[in-house]
């Protein structure tokens, strides 16, 4: 089953996915379509990357982190209710039969009446709470984990700590990850 | 104008390896994945391999990778079909297909060739 | 590996007729369906792809439906060069699978 990810209306979604390369600068294709990922390539192709550069993307579809890195992660800008459903990440790792494939979902809510504070809504869209655990083999599966639930009073510690990066390193470890060679 | 045309087929002893060819025209060739199918008499389709957009993945029916091989030639607007260790089983027509292309979407095969027929008999 | 399974396995029909063929999958392939049309000797034509997408020439009268494991293909009213055998065929697992074909004969 996919893996759940939430974003309001309005907001950015962020959908993990990330890849360990062999060697710096070593990548592997990768795509993203909507929908479940079929037996060959990603359903509707919305980005795609080659072993050198982002060759192919639409609109409101981007990568904000650093994909030269193995970070692949998928922003959507601006959702609306029409982008809720499956997405697809793909990891196009040459040889027989070798694609790593993620089905995650997207489900978007209605904006909220009363605007929830700027840095808790930047924290959500850009970190959703649900997360695949690490895999550490292109054969282990990817299982389902959860980051606590984050309460007003934790915002700034956690804008502190996005600062410091630490955060982060620890998010993007909580990713679904492979490792390449 | 899509065109998909094989080769190579015949007969061939049990043991004995056959090299199919199939030459496309009338779209970027590069573009899309291809793949063969097989028919055998009076059977119905079976998928055999596919092949990605530069040959750098390929994609197997299970019994068949230890002695078939895909391969493309962008080049030369061409895919091949490598089999070895023939069986009689493997006999059947050998269709060259037009898969899926480069932005996804449309999941099916698109275009057909002729087909090539093999036989492996003694 | 996905199983497809046709129903039914032939068929008598007339000209005219309103014709239903099925496909159930085995496990869930979405819409990630195509059917195919073969006549004897021939190549097969690709009819609907994506469970429900018309393929470019192919008469209006061709119609498919279903997502999931439950498909189907409706030819509303069959012409006689209708007459042929139908496969589905699901792009969503590896090995890709057909299924084992409807013949459609004139009663």
């Known amino acids: 089953s996919e893996v759940e990810y939430r974003a309001e209306v309005g907001q950015n979604a962020y959908l993990p996915c990330f890849y360990t390369p062999a060697a710096p600068g070593n990548l592997v294709p990768v795509c993203w379509g909507k929908g479940a990922c079929p037996v060959f390539e990603c359903g509707n192709v919305v980005l795609r990357t080659d072993e050198r550069d982002v060759n192919y993307w639409t609109s409101r579809y981007w990568l904000n982190g650093d994909f030269r890195k193995g970070d692949v992660s998928l922003t959507i800008e601006n959702v609306t209710l029409a982008d809720s459903g499956i997405y697809c990440c793909r990891i196009q790792i040459p040889g027989i039969m070798n694609d790593e494939k993620f089905n995650l979902k997207l489900v978007i809510k209605p904006a909220k009446v009363t605007p929830a504070p700027t840095r808790q809504r930047d924290f959500t869209a850009a970190f959703p709470r649900m997360l695949t655990t690490r895999g550490h083999g292109p054969a282990e599966t990817q299982t389902l984990g959860s980051l606590p639930d984050i309460n007003l009073t934790q915002i700034s510690t956690l804008a502190n700590e996005l600062r410091d990066s630490r955060l982060a390193n620890d998010l993007r470890d909580s990713g679904a990850t492979i490792r390449i060679g | 104008e899509v065109k998909l045309v094989e080769s190579g087929g015949g007969l061939v002893q049990p043991g004995g390896s056959l090299r199919l060819s199939c030459a496309a025209s009338?779209?970027?060739?590069?573009?899309?994945?291809m793949a063969w199918v097989r028919q055998a008499p009076g059977k119905g389709l079976e998928w055999v391999a596919n092949i990605n957009y530069d040959g750098s993945s390929t994609y197997y029916l299970d019994s068949l990778k230890s002695r078939f091989t895909i391969s493309r030639d962008n080049a030369k607007n061409s895919l091949y079909l490598q089999m070895n260790s023939l069986r009689a089983e493997d006999t059947a027509v050998y269709y060259c297909?037009?898969?899926?292309?480069?932005?996804?979407?449309?999941?099916?095969?698109?275009?057909w060739g002729q087909g090539t027929l093999v036989t492996v008999s003694s | 590996d996905i199983q497809m399974t046709q129903s039914p396995s032939s068929l008598s029909a007339s000209v005219g007729d309103r014709v239903t063929i099925t496909c159930r999958a085995s496990d869930n392939i979405y819409s990630y369906l195509a059917w195919y049309q073969q006549k004897p000797g021939k190549a097969p034509k690709l009819l609907v792809y994506n469970a429900k997408t018309l393929a470019e020439g192919v008469p209006s009268r061709f119609s498919g439906s279903g997502s999931g494991t439950d498909f189907t293909l409706t030819i509303s009213s069959l012409q006689p060069e209708d007459f042929a055998t139908y496969y589905c065929?699901?792009?969503?697992?590896?090995?890709?699978?057909f299924g084992q074909g409807t013949k459609l004969e004139i009663k």
């Open positions: 009338g779209f970027t060739f590069s573009d899309y994945y």
């Open positions: 065929q699901q792009h969503y697992g590896s090995p890709l699978t």
């Open positions: 297909a037009r898969d899926v292309g480069y932005y996804g979407g449309n999941y099916g095969f698109a275009y």
